[in-house]
């Protein structure tokens, strides 16, 4: 509402200019290419980077100069395409070149790739990262970005400004340090863990708004909203919902300057009027702006307000439930999302969207009986299996990890995902399961309260990126069918699958599980790897294999790769031992 | 009897201005928040202006600049200056009552709904 209405503009180029400063503008210019065309090198982003900062300048002197009028879809459109041999390098993508605005961007977009056949982004040794940090550390940033970026074509952008903030203030602690690598490699692990995370999360976002809309979205953000801000009344709630919503739809349409501005507006309105929306915000007002927006993104849950009536009082009990339904559908269910999500923030948002769901089904269904009030009057105990089926989850998944530890329980999904969808490659499954089994080591060391909306959040964001991928490559009919639901219903669907039955097992293949000794030399993540795959690989071979069956082969496997790495002479150790590792683990699975 | 009632409606030439008025009654006022909905034919109801029980001001970006909500709490009454009308704001007006705090009381409250045509 309002935060982001101002005057019309003359150049929009000039204003964002104006608005973000040079060094956010060029940043964001180059995240924004990078999404968009992801097999240019850094060094051709960078030249056009340079040319559209350039021309800004141009504009910001004189906003009546020639072209300052346009619209940054056209001036970025036209950069794009004016790049050569694009046809060569990016086949039919070239052919949104033909498009006019709005469509061209909107081709633009639909040929992002989730998955872009990049090589893993590698980090150089500490030595030479610090090297090319101290000759020139904005170019050294700017890869940073174009890495990221080109690899991760949804990621929030002013986020990543904020990561690459992160990054700039850790080299210049830890390149100033005698044991460089010892500073550097714990701190870059967290912040490209967290920003893994956060990629994850925010395609999530992208996801609900391009297949469910604006409204999907707002709804997700009152949840939210309402939850880390119990106190901030619904009209505040609603506001801050709209704004939101508006800042994401614009990052996922790739409108990252208007989206960064937006944000730092959002903050700025935010921290103006801590009073009517939260106690906690002090300390995030506080910082620089790409800290502040961070900090405001991620704060701690307000308190509850001690005198909340129990819902039923308003949503259940009062007579007047199915006029107040009839009269604004949208509106009252907001409000009924809005007081139930500010009194369970032990709750996932996908959660209280499926409570909200539901009760707008019970609604639609009793306002038209004769009684009304007889019917919905037990809804509230109809939500009780919907909050038990996901506590169950937290706990059992907790449990198992606990007890297996993150790579033991990485691999007891492994087994679980691949007996649900064999067809789904193997590569796809091993990222999945990874990442899936990550939630144990981020979600099952917090609080109680906090477990259920960590873990279910978290593990709706990485499913969605297995239907992102799947749709490239439709295999599975059980993963089609949890995917084509509705976003909040996909975790239980994919939690409730069961061993495909329609799967014929993968005939054995006995240079699937043949190894040689350069697997000793792997990083640990990299050996794990080899041996999830292997894993996957038994699963889709004996996809009704018991937990026993597998621990037996994995253990073997295991005590194989440990001998032979230890051996004098790996190469023959690999290549004697191994034959007879692969007829133990087919005896093992007969 | 609990009721709103809205007033002030009319056909009004683009360019010109016209003041809403929300009377309300059998409530207690200053434990609501007042806002106004508009629905046109065939659309959702959406939000055009609210004003919390402090006073605090939230308007729809469409209406930004244009229009202003006030409350008189002694005359248990909100308002809405509409000026610059467009075409575009012609709809029916809803008037609306939301309680924010744990008195007794309706929690969700409508008024009938006042016609306002913007045409030349």
């Known amino acids: 509402r309002g935060v982001f209405r101002r005057e019309a503009h003359k150049s929009e180029i000039a204003h964002r200019y104006n608005d973000l400063g040079e060094q956010h503008f060029k940043g964001l210019v180059l995240i924004a290419f990078s999404q968009y065309l992801q097999k240019c090198s850094y060094d051709e982003h960078a030249k056009l980077v340079q040319e559209v900062t350039d021309f800004a300048k141009t504009c910001v002197a004189d906003e009546s100069a020639a072209n300052c009028d346009k619209s940054l879809h056209t001036l970025f459109g036209d950069k794009l395409c004016a790049i050569p041999n694009l046809r060569e390098n990016y086949g039919e993508l070239a052919d949104c070149c033909t498009k006019q605005e709005p469509e061209r961007n909107e081709c633009f977009l639909q040929h992002k790739d989730d998955n872009p056949s990049l090589p893993p982004f590698e980090r150089p040794e500490a030595e030479a990262m610090c090297t090319s940090f101290k000759e020139n550390p904005t170019t050294f940033m700017g890869h940073y970005l174009h890495e990221v970026a080109r690899r991760h074509p949804y990621f929030y952008a002013p986020e990543l400004l904020y990561y690459a903030e992160q990054y700039n203030e850790i080299l210049t602690q830890c390149c100033a340090e005698a044991d460089k690598e010892s500073c550097l490699t714990p701190k870059l692990d967290g912040v490209k863990e967290k920003a893994l995370v956060s990629s994850v999360r925010q395609r999530m976002k992208c996801s609900s708004m391009q297949k469910f809309g604006e409204r999907a979205f707002k709804a997700w953000a009152v949840a939210r909203l309402s939850q880390t801000f119990p106190n901030a009344d619904f009209a505040e709630i609603t506001k801050l919902a709209t704004d939101l919503t508006k800042v994401n739809k614009e990052c996922c349409h790739g409108d990252l300057l208007e989206c960064a501005d937006d944000r730092a507006e959002l903050a700025k309105y935010m921290c103006e009027n801590q009073a009517t929306i939260s106690s906690k915000l002090q300390t995030c007002c506080d910082k620089p702006l790409l800290k502040k927006a961070h900090c405001l993104s991620e704060v701690e849950h307000d308190t509850m307000p001690a005198d909340l009536p129990a819902i039923a009082a308003d949503f259940v009990e009062d007579q007047e439930v199915c006029k107040n339904y009839a009269e604004a559908k949208d509106v009252f269910l907001g409000t009924f999302l809005y007081e139930y999500s500010r009194r369970h923030p032990d709750y996932s948002v996908s959660l209280l969207l499926r409570l909200a769901k539901k009760y707008e089904a019970t609604l639609e269904k009793c306002c038209a009986e004769a009684n009304p009030p007889a019917c919905y009057g037990t809804v509230l105990a109809e939500f009780q299996p919907l909050v038990e089926e996901p506590k169950n989850l937290v706990k059992t998944n907790c449990d198992l990890y606990e007890k297996l530890g993150e790579y033991g329980f990485q691999n007891a999904i492994l087994v679980r995902y691949t007996q649900k969808a064999p067809q789904v490659s193997t590569p796809t499954l091993v990222e999945a399961a990874r990442n899936l089994g990550r939630v144990g080591t981020k979600c099952c060391t917090l609080p109680e309260d906090q477990r259920l909306p960590c873990v279910e959040d978290y593990l709706s964001a990485i499913l969605n990126r297995v239907c992102l991928l799947h749709e490239k490559t439709p295999v599975s009919e059980h993963v089609t069918k949890c995917c084509s639901g509705s976003l909040v219903e996909r975790r239980p669907c994919f939690s409730a699958l069961t061993v495909d039955e329609t799967y014929v097992p993968k005939e054995f293949k006995a240079e699937t599980f043949t190894f040689h000794s350069d697997i000793c030399t792997l990083p640990e993540k990299e050996k794990q790897i080899k041996k999830q795959t292997a894993l996957a690989e038994l699963v889709k071979h004996k996809p009704k294999a018991t937990a026993e069956q597998l621990k037996t082969v994995m253990d073997d496997f295991a005590q194989f790769l440990d001998t032979c790495c230890k051996a004098a002479d790996k190469d023959t150790c690999f290549s004697t031992e191994g034959p007879n590792l692969v007829t133990r683990c087919k005896d093992a699975l007969a | 009897e609990v009721q709103l009632e809205e007033s002030g409606g009319g056909l009004v030439q683009p360019g010109g201005s016209l003041r809403l008025s929300c009377a309300a009654s059998g409530l207690t006022f200053n434990d609501y928040a007042m806002g106004w909905y508009r629905q046109a034919p065939g659309k959702e109801r959406d939000m055009v202006a609210t004003?919390?029980?402090?006073?605090?001001?939230y308007y729809a970006d469409s209406v930004k600049g244009r229009f202003t909500i006030s409350r008189d709490n002694a005359k248990n009454t909100v308002y809405l200056q509409m000026n610059s009308l467009k075409p575009e704001d012609t709809a029916i007006y809803y008037c609306v009552a939301h309680r924010q705090t744990v008195v007794r009381g309706p929690y969700l409250l409508w008024g009938q709904g006042t016609q306002v045509t913007v045409s030349s």
């Open positions: 004003i919390s029980i402090g006073g605090r001001t």
